[in-house]
């Protein structure tokens, strides 16, 4: 049978020929009668055999990491007979490992992100090195990890390559770190080989900084003419955090006057001070408000960094604007009796300069020839007034500052002209009527009414009478109806067209004014020839008949 030991050949042997071992048949008595042969991959090129002795040699340098074992076949032949002494047999040559490979980090580049202020022990990343040497051969591939750069902030677990935080880091001081990790084989013993890798560790932001005002004091100005909603200036805080963690909200902490507001421009992160209520320089020209700023998003666990909001004080100076005069009232209503003499007092208006300089005021009345106004605001009549022509005057009073004539204010002035009893009542229309020749006594021939151009505080009341002459002439009589009308009646029977074709009756109408006024009004009565039916046949004036619509035949 075959006799051999297990064959080992160290890798990387530099000698030209290295004896590995001997293949032998136990039938070989050493008289060189057998011939040994080597077959298979590597036979003749990598390995050779001494045909006489069966000694095997490696004639090439071997690399275990390239090939760790060779499977060869051996034959032994009797030289004399040429026949196989033993059956062909397979045998193995193992390439034994030497520490000729350093550890390599295969997953480079390494990059990790970890939140700033993470506590000690927080896992950052695991790095893994690989060693091509034989892990089963001693310590050639047993690795140990260590930190070459990154203390005191990071540490690495020696056997796992797990990188952990060993000291809290503040992104606002440094936002990224390069850590260098070394992997050594031979568990770090002498003669070990090493490899290194760099790990870029970036710190992600957490909201550990509150916003702080750039200035502890701001100065802004606002014109007293500025409308509400006007932006009067900006204030600015800075936050060392980034992104969402730097978003802030401004607000007012103190403003007794409730005159201002602050809104946040979320694009620029500025606070915009706006006017909430109109300001008046003459009332208050200096304001002080305290503003505060807070982050928009603060997780509960980070509230400890945001206990007291940053504040700033804002002084706001109101700028004076020359304002037009201000009337005491929005409009004035005065009363004056008609027929009062020219120069009569009507009323007094008053305007003042609201500004501190208190300019004197000049007054004028627009479009009026009836009234005058002096520099004291006293209004008088410049003509006699007639209520029956104009009962109301709608005017405009203008006040102008003496020191700045461009500063003008106008308000309405209403003057009511009060009535005096200066008009007697008179017929409401022209009355012209007729009486038939055959009219009987007491026949109603006309109802009359009156009007009075005066205004009556109570209802107008008119009194109707015939004049003294007509009272004595008994052809007609009058009855006052007590309702501002009266009826004219015949006071006799029969009239004669030929003798007296027309009567002119004087009627006195008095009003109830104090003093009472009376007018004399003439009623014309035509005598007509009437038929039995009462239809008019002939009157002296055909026009009258026509105008009265009577039939003429």
């Amino acid at each position: 049978g075959w006799v051999w030991n297990q064959f080992f050949v160290p890798e990387e042997m530099n000698t030209t020929s290295h004896h590995i071992g001997q293949l032998r048949s136990d039938l070989d008595n050493g008289n060189n009668s057998f011939q040994y042969k080597l077959l298979g991959a590597g036979a003749g090129s990598t390995f050779i055999i001494d045909e006489r002795t069966g000694d095997i040699y490696a004639i090439q340098k071997l690399d275990r990491e390239e090939r760790s074992l060779y499977i060869l076949r051996a034959q032994v032949i009797d030289i004399a007979t040429g026949r196989a002494v033993e059956p062909e047999s397979e045998f193995v040559i193992k390439v034994s490992d030497i520490n000729d490979n350093e550890p390599k980090f295969l997953d480079e580049p390494y990059e990790a992100i970890v939140p700033e202020m993470s506590p000690e022990g927080t896992l950052v990343i695991q790095v893994t090195a690989s060693d091509a040497d034989d892990p089963s051969s001693g310590n050639n591939a047993r690795l140990l990890y260590s930190l070459l750069q990154g203390q005191p902030y990071f540490s690495v677990e020696p056997t796992t390559g797990v990188i952990r935080i060993s000291s809290k880091m503040d992104r606002e001081l440094q936002d990224e770190y390069w850590v260098i990790i070394q992997a050594k084989d031979m568990i770090g013993q002498p003669g070990a080989l090493s490899g290194t890798t760099s790990v870029l560790i970036k710190l992600s932001d957490v909201n550990d900084n509150k916003p702080i005002f750039k200035e502890s004091l701001y100065r802004l100005t606002v014109s007293e003419s500025a409308p509400t909603g006007t932006s009067i200036g900006t204030i600015m805080a800075y936050d060392n955090d980034i992104g969402e963690n730097a978003e802030m909200d401004y607000s007012i902490e103190e403003d007794d006057s409730q005159t201002f507001d602050i809104i946040t421009n979320h694009e620029t992160q500025e606070g915009i001070v706006i006017l909430k209520k109109k300001v008046d320089f003459e009332h208050q020209n200096h304001y002080g408000i305290r503003a505060k700023v807070k982050n928009h998003h603060v997780p509960e666990q980070l509230m400890k960094y945001h206990t007291e909001a940053s504040t700033t004080f804002i002084k706001i100076q109101v700028e004076d604007v020359d304002e037009p005069p201000l009337f005491l009232l929005p409009y004035y209503v005065f009363e004056v009796f008609e027929e009062t003499p020219q120069g009569s007092f009507v009323g007094v208006v008053s305007a003042t300069d609201p500004d501190n300089r208190k300019s004197p005021i000049r007054y004028s009345i627009t479009r009026s020839k009836v009234f005058n106004i002096n520099d004291n605001g006293t209004i008088t009549t410049s003509n006699s007034l007639d209520r029956e022509i104009s009962a109301w005057y709608n005017l405009s009073i203008t006040a102008t500052e003496k020191y700045n004539i461009e500063q003008i204010s106008s308000i309405p002035l209403y003057v009511q002209v009060l009535n005096i009893n200066d008009h007697a009542p008179e017929f409401s229309q022209y009355y012209e009527t007729y009486v038939c020749e055959n009219a009987g006594s007491g026949q109603v021939i006309q109802t009359i009414s009156a009007v009075d151009r005066d205004e009556s505080i109570e209802e107008h009341h008119f009194y109707f009478n015939l004049s003294v002459e007509d009272t004595n002439n008994s052809s007609f009589t009058i009855i006052d109806n007590q309702d501002n009308t009266a009826v004219i009646l015949t006071n006799r029977t029969g009239f004669n067209l030929q003798e007296e074709p027309v009567f002119y009756i004087s009627i006195l109408i008095a009003d109830n004014g104090i003093p009472s006024l009376t007018s004399t009004n003439t009623l014309t009565i035509h005598v007509c020839d009437c038929g039995d039916s009462g239809s008019t046949q002939t009157c002296q004036y055909q026009e009258l008949v026509l105008s009265m619509g009577f039939k003429t035949e």
């Epitope: 200035e215 502890s216 004091l217 701001y218 100065r219 100005t221 103190e254 007794d256 006057s257 003459e282 009332h283 208050q284 020209n285 200096h286 304001y287 002080g288 305290r290 004080f313 002084k315």
Partner: antibody, heavy 120, light 107 residues
């Protein structure tokens, strides 16, 4: 600590112009948000504010003195000045310069004052 | 302009006593716009209180201010010998005006 020091003639003739300067030390006159005032005190009487100036040159005066007062600022010298024209004996007073506060318009820092007498 | 009236004109008290000084405005002012000053003879006024209850830097806590609208008060809880001097109130809302002063003297 901000300190203010008034300087100028102690005697001015009637109808002339009173001129005083206030020198600021321990702080910049150009500090944002602060106003620099002149205040006077007639002998044995109360205090009267004259006017103030901001480092930009923007000034505001007491309306009762406005027509006679000019306040100016020189940031390079850290000084501000008062000019009061057409003086009369009624302008005899101790004149103080002052700076307002960081939380309001009150007067936080004062100079020690300088007496100006108007007399012929 | 806003006129400030201080009362009493003179207040006679003994050391250790409580002093109450009044300042009245001719029209309502926001409490944030009133200050108190102390002035010793030959010296410039010194800010005591502003806004109207905040003590200025270095002012002892025996000094306190209060009030709103038109009526304001400076209180000195226990008078010390150095407190016997003149006190002025000042409004700084509408321009700047001072009260005529209250003199605190030793009884």
């Amino acid at each position: 600590q901000v300190q203010l020091q008034e300087s100028g003639p102690g005697l001015v003739k009637p109808s002339q112009t009173l001129s005083l300067t206030c020198t600021v030390s321990g702080g910049s006159i150009s500090s944002s948000g602060y106003y620099w005032s002149w205040i006077r005190q007639h002998p044995g009487k109360g205090l009267e504010w004259i006017g103030y100036i901001y480092y930009t040159g923007s000034a505001y005066y007491n309306p009762s003195l406005k027509s006679r007062v000019t306040i100016s600022v020189d940031t390079s010298k850290n000084q501000f000045s008062l000019k009061l024209s057409s003086v009369t004996a009624a302008d005899t007073a101790v004149y103080y310069c002052a700076r307002d506060g960081s939380s309001g318009w009150y007067f936080q820092y004062w100079g020690q004052g300088t007496l100006v007498t108007v007399s012929s | 302009e806003i006129v400030l009236t201080q009362s009493p004109g003179t207040l006679s008290l003994s050391p250790g006593e409580r002093a109450t000084l009044s300042c009245r405005a001719s029209q309502s002012i926001s409490s944030s716009y009133l200050a108190w000053y102390q002035q010793k003879p030959g010296q410039a006024p010194r800010l005591l209180i502003y806004g109207p209850s905040s003590r200025a830097t270095g002012i002892p806590d025996r000094f306190s201010g209060s009030g709103s609208g038109t009526d304001f008060t400076l209180t000195i809880s226990r008078l010390e010998p150095e407190d016997f001097t003149v006190y002025y109130c000042q409004q700084y809302g509408s321009s700047f005006t001072f009260g005529p002063g209250t003199k605190v003297d030793i009884k």
